[in-house]
Interface confidence: low
């Protein structure tokens, strides 16, 4: 932005500038150019020897300017167009300035003036051009500064040229008021802070409903000596509930929201939310729908899942395998987990109680992601009810629970766990164990054994203890051994069939 302090051409001859010496040299003339009257100061003393003619402007108030720009439009006639080449003719003139705090009026003193430059034309007007009224107009610009006093004068020294001064324009530059990145930068005088720092740093202020992002830099711009803004640093962002529309922040329309200061536009309220009002920072969930604390506000509101589907309990001795399928309604979420709880009931008394402490789960039962789990260490002749609950990230926000139950009665003891304790060429010492809680129900243990490959005959031994030595066996022979608990009600669960081999007669080490 240019702020004009002086414009000779615009004043249409109303500026009476001082000429020195008075009545000689520079003179104000009117001419017609393009059917318009134009005013100019001209001088053309080219045959009168050395010249020293001065033209001084009126006093110009500096305003806020520190550096001024002087734009001159002028024409210079070719010295060769004068008789004899006019030996004293020149084709340049000099430009001066003087600062002062007051207007000296007609008191003109050359010594107060400082030379800015010698002004030479790029093109001179030759005779043929002049006769055809085709003058060559030159434009030159000079910069002066820094200025410190209240005002200044310019002066033009003629040293014997034929010059017409058509325009003198003095201005200073401002970086204009500007909106950039939602920040308003004030109109700023274009000044160089120093030779090494030719840019002035200007802080901007965020427009209404815009803020500096958290941890970010405030908006800064640099105003150059040429009145141009450069190198923006930092930015402002529309605050929550507002979006950028051109250079302003506008409230989100009803039905839209914005939850944080960012460059993104307002977003439409997600599914299962109530339509927001103007300038909303979030959209409330519909009744029955919720947001987990970690859910982004742009995510649809969700609800707890329905109960798991198709829960089955498959009894395997003193174990139960629970299997189920995912809920029909996931509530719109993927983060489904299952928890299993257990209740045992004594058939005789009908008394029931929790059984978490006495059973063993194949994996922790309270954050299952798979849809099956095995429960072991179940007591025989006991009724068990298992509840499988489906939960997701918003289940904790409601009191109701979504679960399915399955019941199973344990009639058998758990199969004994069998191992080979010792062996020889003719004997096998076998031991076994069952859970302590089930031992009181066992009357005897039945050990069945036979040679591998001999399907026609087998031997049975009964004992009340937890071990047996099987004698009179053949050396280097594999025997199939199974242990079964016998209860008052009949046979309990049998162990799996184990293969144990007697030692050979050649090497009888264990």
């Amino acid at each position: 932005k240019e702020v004009v302090l002086l414009d000779f051409a615009a004043m249409k001859g109303e500026l009476g500038w001082l000429t020195h010496p008075y009545g000689k040299g520079w003179d104000l003339m009117q001419n017609i150019m393009d059917d318009m009257p134009i005013y100019m100061y001209s001088v053309c003393n080219v045959v009168s020897g050395d010249q020293d003619n001065w033209l001084r402007t009126n006093w110009v108030y500096r305003e806020e300017a520190e550096r001024i720009f002087i734009e001159l439009k002028f024409t210079v006639r070719d010295c060769n167009s004068f008789p004899g080449g006019a030996s004293s003719c020149k084709e340049t003139f000099n430009l001066y300035y003087a600062e002062s705090d007051v207007d000296y009026g007609t008191n003109f003193q050359k010594r107060q003036f400082t030379k800015i430059d010698t002004i030479a034309p790029d093109e001179i007007t030759v005779s043929s051009d002049f006769e055809a009224r085709n003058v060559k107009l030159n434009v030159e610009e000079r910069m002066v500064g820094p200025l410190t006093r209240k005002g200044f004068y310019l002066a033009f020294q003629d040293i014997g040229a034929c010059v017409a001064l058509l325009s003198v324009r003095v201005y200073y530059k401002k970086c204009p008021e500007m909106l950039q990145s939602l920040a308003r930068f004030p109109e700023t005088i274009a000044v160089a802070v120093s030779d090494t720092q030719p840019l002035a740093t200007v802080a901007g202020t965020c427009v209404d409903h815009a803020v500096v992002p958290y941890g970010g830099e405030g908006p800064l711009m640099h105003c150059t000596v040429d009145g141009e803004w450069l190198v923006p640093i930092g930015q402002c962002l529309c605050q929550e509930g507002y979006e950028k529309v051109e250079d302003a922040c506008r409230a989100c329309s009803p039905g839209f929201f914005k939850s944080e200061a960012s460059e993104s536009p307002c977003l439409e309220c997600p599914e299962h939310t109530l339509p927001s009002t103007e300038g909303a920072t979030s959209c409330q969930c519909e009744e029955g729908y919720f947001r987990a604390p970690e859910d982004p506000l742009s995510m649809s509101c969700t609800r707890p899942p329905s109960a798991p589907n198709y829960l089955t309990a498959i009894g395997m001795g003193a174990k139960v395998e629970l299997r189920w399928t995912a809920p029909k309604d996931t509530g719109g979420r993927q983060d489904i987990v299952y928890s299993v709880t257990c209740e045992q009931c004594w058939p005789e008394s009908g008394e029931c109680g929790p059984c978490e402490a006495s059973v063993r789960y194949s994996e922790p039962p309270h954050a299952l992601t798979r849809t099956s789990v095995t429960v072991s260490d179940l007591e025989p002749h006991m009724n068990y009810t298992f509840a499988v609950e489906a939960r997701n990230g918003v289940s904790g926000l409601v009191t109701s629970r979504s679960f399915r139950t399955a019941s199973v009665s344990i009639n058998q003891t758990e199969p004994p766990k069998v191992r080979l304790e010792d062996r020889s060429t003719t004997s096998l010492s076998v031991t076994w164990s069952i859970p302590v809680s089930q031992q009181s129900r066992v009357w005897k243990y039945e050990v069945t054994y036979r040679k591998k490959g001999d399907a026609n005959s087998y031997n049975v031994r009964r004992t009340e203890g937890f071990s047996v030595t099987l004698d009179d066996l053949a050396p280097d022979t594999t025997y199939l051994v199974q242990v079964q608990a016998l209860t008052q009600e009949g046979q309990g669960a049998g162990s799996k069939v184990h293969e144990f081999q007697t030692l050979s007669t050649e090497g009888s080490a264990n």
Epitope: E243, V245, R250, C252, S253, P254, G255, F256, P265, C266, L267, E268, E271, L274, P275, T277, E278, G279, Q284, E286
Partner: antibody, heavy 126, light 112 residues
Framework: EVQLVESGGGLVQPGGSLRLSCAAS????????MNWVRQAPGKGLEWVSY????????YYADSVKGRFTISRDNAKNSLYLQMNSLRAEDTAVYYC???????????????????WGQGTTVTVSS | QSVLTQPPSVSGAPGQRVTISCTGS?????????VHWYQQLPGTAPKLLIY???NRPSGVPDRFSGSKSGTSASLAITGLQAEDEADYYC????????????FGGGTKLTVL
């Protein structure tokens, strides 16, 4: 010419079902949300249901929730209202109406229901 | 009972000015939601008359104007003409209702 034409109305017994259709022409149907609005004889306008342009958001008035189903087929430029378990109080002229929601580029204003069909009459009576 | 309250009827002589009010609450008009007005000529479908509180669709004469303040809105008709005789409905949105869209009960305008 921008036009909405409803069809499918008629006389039905209480507890019965009807399916209303609304054929759209003269504009890009898939860019607009749509509504069904009804007017009982001698009464005012009552909003019935809303469906967004992509069918991702659907709303119903409490009076029809669980009985009516709104749907659309953008490929066929058609809007539908499946009405089940009809009651005598559902007797009305049913209008489909185009609804332009303010998007975040054009922002304000909210254009309201700017195009209406001529209506189709539903009578529920034994 | 409508969520938005309108007078059941208003009347005016040709050339006169009439206004129709539409009163809501803090959950609808007072919550910042837009108000639209519809005109229903006898035996015809409703027609959008004013949208976004005060905007006229093309083709609607400038005799019709809308405004909104606080929890109320109003429709003004100047230079009343015989063809203005119709039912007028206001419509807005209510955050407390499942579907959010609400109409006024309607106002019958009679040109005397």
């Amino acid at each position: 010419e921008v036009q909405l034409v409803e069809s499918g109305g008629g006389l039905v017994q209480p507890g019965g079902s009807l399916r209303l259709s609304c054929a759209a022409s003269g504009f890009t149907f898939s860019s607009y949300s749509m509504n069904w609005v009804r007017q009982a004889p001698g009464k005012g306008l009552e909003w019935v249901s809303y469906i967004s342009s992509s069918s991702s958001t659907i709303y119903y008035a409490d009076s029809v929730k669980g009985r009516f189903t709104i749907s659309r087929d953008n490929a066929k430029n058609s809007l539908y209202l499946q009405m089940n378990s009809l009651r005598a109080e559902d007797t009305a002229v049913y209008y489909c109406a185009r609804y332009r929601f303010p998007d975040f580029w054009s922002g304000y204003p909210n254009y309201g229901m700017d195009v209406w069909g001529q209506g189709t009459t539903v009578t529920v009576s034994s | 009972q409508s969520v938005l309250t309108q007078p059941p009827s208003v009347s005016g002589a040709p050339g006169q000015r009439v206004t129709i009010s539409c009163t809501g609450s803090s959950s609808n008009i007072g919550a910042g939601y837009d108000v639209h007005w519809y005109q229903q000529l006898p035996g015809t479908a409703p027609k959008l008359l004013i949208y976004g509180n005060s905007n006229r669709p093309s083709g609607v004469p400038d005799r019709f104007s809308g405004s909104k303040s606080g929890t109320s809105a109003s429709l003004a008709i100047t230079g009343l003409q015989a063809e203005d005789e119709a039912d007028y409905y206001c419509q807005s949105y209510d955050s407390s209702l499942s579907g959010h869209v609400v109409f006024g009960g309607g106002t019958k305008l009679t040109v005397l």
